[in-house]
Interface confidence: low
């Protein structure tokens, strides 16, 4: 299995609205690991079921 995430550089620390930035392994593009209560590509959606 290829892991989805690698570490982000410091330049992208503000990329995720409610989460921690990671980089896509196969792509030079940031992605997010969301904090509890949030979902979405940039953790932009409040998870009403959390």
């Amino acid at each position: 299995v290829v892991s989805h995430f690698n570490d982000c550089p410091d330049s992208h620390t503000q990329f995720c609205f409610h989460g921690t930035c990671r980089f896509l392994v196969q792509e030079d593009k940031p992605a997010c690991v969301c904090h509890s209560g949030y979902v979405g590509a940039r953790c932009e959606h409040a998870d009403l079921l959390a």
Epitope: V1, V2, S3, H4, L24, V25, Q26, E27, D28, K29, A31, V33, C34, V39, G40, A41, H45, D47, L48, L49
Partner: antibody, heavy 116, light 107 residues
Amino acid sequence: VQLQESGPGLAKPSQTLSLTCSVTGYSITSDYWNWIRKFPGNKLEYMGYISYSGSTYYNPSLKSRISITRDTSKNQYYLQLNSVTTEDTATYYCARSYDGICFDNWGQGTTLTVSS
Amino acid sequence: DILMTQSPATLSVTPGETVSLSCRASQNTYKNLHWYQQKSHGTPKLLIKYASAPISGIPSRFTGSGSGTDYTLSINSVKPEDEGIYYCLQGYSMPWTFGGGTKLEIK
């Protein structure tokens, strides 16, 4: 965003499959542009993408046979699958994803039958 | 690859019933789980993204829940037009993988 697949419909074993996805209403220099196929029996398989920057990801199960390319001047992207067999008989879809993951716009699909 | 298992394979319900479709992942997908509907001779349509986030234009009777490895798509008060095949898709670990689908039949 509208996506439309086109292709031959029929191929013989060992031939190379070439499909085109024509995109209207949105530039392929943004987001991710994917190929997905649906086999008889309804199983879906993710094949790969070409991104906004032109970089690609291929499903390792296909890596030795697949190529995804694009022509930004035509706003089209392409799937090439080498050495097809009857196991490649499927409906092939192109699809957009804004984040590389979530497919929110799909084409109508084009059916390929591989038969001798 | 992450294996996605959907159950039941087929579900036959009467209009007005509420149904739950299950999707189980072989490892944690951290809510990177999306639901699609495909009607007969149609194209897949995104219903729910990131386990529970609603999609604009999708009726509110479709709701998603779950986390970790276990996810559920619920359809409240099923309508005849809901007939089709429902797929889950994990978007946590490449390659992205789909479940085998649940075929929803309306009596």
